[in-house]
């Protein structure tokens, strides 16, 4: 089981949207995938994916989850608030036939205040 997460760094303006992507790769077929998104070490949500279906659509404040088979889990924050700034990690596990767990590298989200006098560019860098 491996998890690739992106982007590494994401800078957005308050009130806009931020999209974090988690790619879960498993060599063998799985029946149930458990995933967690954490922010600064605290669990935002922990849905299950069975038969290509997410058990949960909400993930933390203003967070929406989506699953694109075979491997892409997306967390969309919309609208983004200053409180969304932090370090996000995607974790995944399968229990069958053996317990396997993996987590992605950190996505650091920076949220700029909605202040027209601060004209900073958005940054989005993906691994690789």
């Amino acid at each position: 089981l491996s998890v690739q997460q992106g982007p590494n760094l994401l800078q957005v303006r308050q009130g806009s949207q931020a999209t974090l992507v988690c790619q879960v790769d498993q060599a063998t077929a799985w029946e149930r995938l458990r995933v967690k998104w954490t922010k600064d070490g605290a669990i935002l949500c922990q849905p299950y994916i069975t038969n290509g279906s997410l058990s949960l659509g909400v993930c933390g404040p203003q967070g929406r989850l989506s699953w694109q088979a075979p491997s892409h889990l997306t967390l969309q924050l919309d609208p983004v608030s200053l409180n969304h700034s932090g370090a996000y990690v995607c974790w995944a596990a399968v229990e069958i036939p053996e317990l396997e767990e993996a987590e992605g590298n950190i996505t650091r989200l920076f949220v700029d205040p909605d202040d027209p006098t601060q004209n900073r560019n958005r940054i989005a860098s993906f691994p690789g």
Epitope: E31, I43, Q46, Y48, S53, S55
Partner: antibody, heavy 120, light 107 residues
């Protein structure tokens, strides 16, 4: 309404294999859910042993993995627990229970429990 | 394994009392916590899952709250049939584990 009923010998000798059956009525074990075994030592808390899911795949508590097998007979709508090389520490009330495999692992339906004593 | 510590382990209360039982997890479990009621010689019954969702048919006097590591089961007005032992369970980390139980007895 789903009902679960455990059955099996109440007395097992040390080093032997404990075998229990859970018979499910009112719901097909192949339709959905995970079908669990748990136990409760006398006067103590609950311990999850493992499950077999609706698709027939099993998952076990690592603490007992080397000794546990959970299987099923879909024609009889039953699932089974085998625990090998038992000792007195395996004396407990054993429960079968159903959990929502697609949404959470809370146990929403239980059997009444069966007491197993390991003694020579 | 994730450890769940319940407190108190024993509680003496009267009919009509408000009762609060706490469950502390050894690590963050989000809201993946369930609560059960067990009476002597009987199987546990599910009361609450996902920390705060009442199971079908459970009276509204039972409520659950909390997230992360600290969880609470509250019985707003204790009824005679509520004297029992209560357990929390986490389903965030594998294997699923239970708290040691809180026995609620008649004062």
């Amino acid at each position: 309404q789903v009902q679960l009923q455990e059955s099996g010998p109440g007395l097992v000798k040390p080093s032997q294999t404990l075998s229990l059956t859970c018979t499910v009525t009112g719901y097909s074990i192949t339709s959905d859910f995970a079908w669990n075994w748990l136990r409760q030592h006398p006067g103590k808390g609950l311990e999850w042993i493992g499950y077999i899911n609706y698709a027939g795949s099993s998952s076990y508590n690592p603490s007992h993995k080397s000794r546990v097998t959970i299987s099923r007979d879909t024609s009889k709508n039953q699932f089974f627990l085998k625990l090998s090389s038992v000792t007195a520490a395996d004396t407990a009330v054993y429960y079968c229970a159903r959990s929502n495999y697609r949404n959470d692992d809370a146990m929403d339906s239980w059997g009444q429990g069966t007491t197993v004593t390991v003694s020579s | 394994d994730i450890q769940l510590t319940q407190s108190p382990s024993f509680l003496s209360a009267s009919v009509g009392d408000r009762v609060t039982i706490t469950c502390k997890a050894s690590q963050d479990v989000g809201t993946a916590v369930a609560w059960y009621q067990q009476k002597p010689g009987k199987a546990p019954k599910l009361l609450i899952y996902w920390a705060s969702t009442r199971h079908t048919g459970v009276p509204s006097r039972f409520s659950g709250s909390g997230s992360g590591t600290d969880f609470t089961l509250t019985i707003s007005s204790l009824q005679p049939e509520d004297f029992a032992t209560y357990y929390c369970q986490q389903f965030s980390g594998f294997p699923w584990t239970f708290g040691g139980g809180t026995k609620v007895e008649i004062k």
